[in-house]
Amino acid sequence: HNTTVFQGVAGQSLQVSCPYDSMKHWGRRKAWCRQLGEKGPCQRVVSTHNLWLLSFLRRWNGSTAITDDTLGGTLTITLRNLQPHDAGLYQCQSLHGSEADTLRKVLVEVLADPLDHRDAGDLWFPGESESFEDAHVEHSISRSLLEGEIPFPPTS
């Protein structure tokens, strides 16, 4: 699996989308988990409704929400009030019993809020096409990691 990078701004909401084959994963609940270390386990953060039929209902665990468009085949995760400690590697998963299929590997990057002048050294300026007129806009930039790029900092 390639890793897709989603960038969000600290204090704002970040929306992560995971597309999948709706027929292949029909009837399967989904989950969002956080990878603990490069080869460690993936710790469940939140999963969709216990009744697959109700997967469209948004479920929250703290500041993280999950909702599943089972017909369209898109799992959406919302990280509200993004914080630096939210940065890291995650997975979207399709559950079958005690097993899980990885739908997408996601690297969440948290960028400093350009309107927060407390830490001017970490300012990140939006490009021309991005606007911060509405502070509640859910903002995400995503890209795939280039071949050879490492999602975790090397350990010494």
């Epitope: 084959d21 027929m23 029909w26 009837g27 039929l53 019993g97 005690s98």
Partner: antibody
Framework: EVQLVQSGAEVKKPGESLKISCKGS????????IGWVRQMPGKGLEWMGI????????RYSPSFQGQVTISVDKSSSTAYLQWSSLKASDTAIYYC???????????????WGQGTLVTVSS | EIVLTQSPGTLSLSPGERATLSCRAS???????LAWYQQKPGQAPRLLIY???SRATGIPDRFSGSGSGTDFTLTISRLEPEDFALYYC?????????FGPGTKVDIK
């Protein structure tokens, strides 16, 4: 009408190779998982494995991993079960079956092929 | 893998009687992804019940399924002559999608 039609009975010698088929019709073949089930003479049903024709994702039962190969040909809407070296203990009826879906989720396996009798004897 | 145990191994009953077949799983079957099949000699299995309690298309209402977690039951309210056959339960929650050993319902 959704149908799975399997290839005919086979008589083989130990050590020979074999590929049996299961042709799907009446539905979008690439959108439903296809499973294979073994039934030895006078015995119960044994799950062998399953394949998703859309991307050929395959899951084998540990008992059959490395013993058989499950594959598909999307262009002919056909699933296959093959052996590279048959043993006398492979003598059985082999069924293919489709994972059904329901509004509420998954719906068991339906329909089933008519079965292919494989006899391995020297 | 999930191991399914069916009981009794054989059930000897007369037409018109009620048949109760049990299927127990070694671990919880989430989403109640448990099915029941009927198989007659020389025929392929036929789906009766899916999702533990939903009848498959064309299955008479004398067949009903119940249960959740690890304990499931297939009930045939009044046995008809054509109901004497082998019955298998199957979990399709966790791969491999295992079957129970079967219960034979025969004529007393």
């Amino acid at each position: 009408e959704v149908q799975l039609v399997q290839s005919g009975a086979e008589v083989k010698k130990p050590g020979e190779s074999l590929k049996i088929s299961c042709k799907g019709s009446g539905y979008t073949f690439t959108s439903y998982w296809i499973g294979w089930v073994r039934q030895m003479p006078g015995k119960g049903l044994e799950w062998m494995g399953i394949i998703y024709p859309g991307d050929s994702d395959t899951r084998y039962s540990p008992s059959f991993q490395g013993q058989v190969t499950i594959s598909v040909d999307k262009s002919s809407s056909t699933a296959y079960l093959q052996w590279s070296s048959l043993k006398a203990s492979d003598t059985a009826i082999y069924y293919c079956t489709r994972q059904a879906i329901a509004v509420t989720g998954l719906g068991g396996f339906d329909p089933w092929g008519q079965g292919t009798l494989v006899t391995v004897s020297s | 893998e999930i191991v399914l145990t069916q009981s009794p191994g054989t059930l000897s009953l007369s037409p018109g009687e009620r048949a109760t077949l049990s299927c127990r799983a070694s671990q919880s079957v989430s989403s109640s992804y448990l099915a029941w099949y009927q198989q007659k000699p020389g025929q392929a299995p036929r789906l009766l019940i899916y999702g533990a309690s939903s009848r498959a298309t064309g299955i008479p209402d004398r067949f009903s399924g119940s249960g959740s977690g690890t304990d499931f039951t297939l009930t045939i309210s009044r046995l008809e002559p054509e109901d004497f056959a082998l019955y298998y339960c199957q979990q399709y929650d966790t791969s491999p999608f295992t079957f129970g050993p079967g219960t034979k319902v025969d004529i007393k």
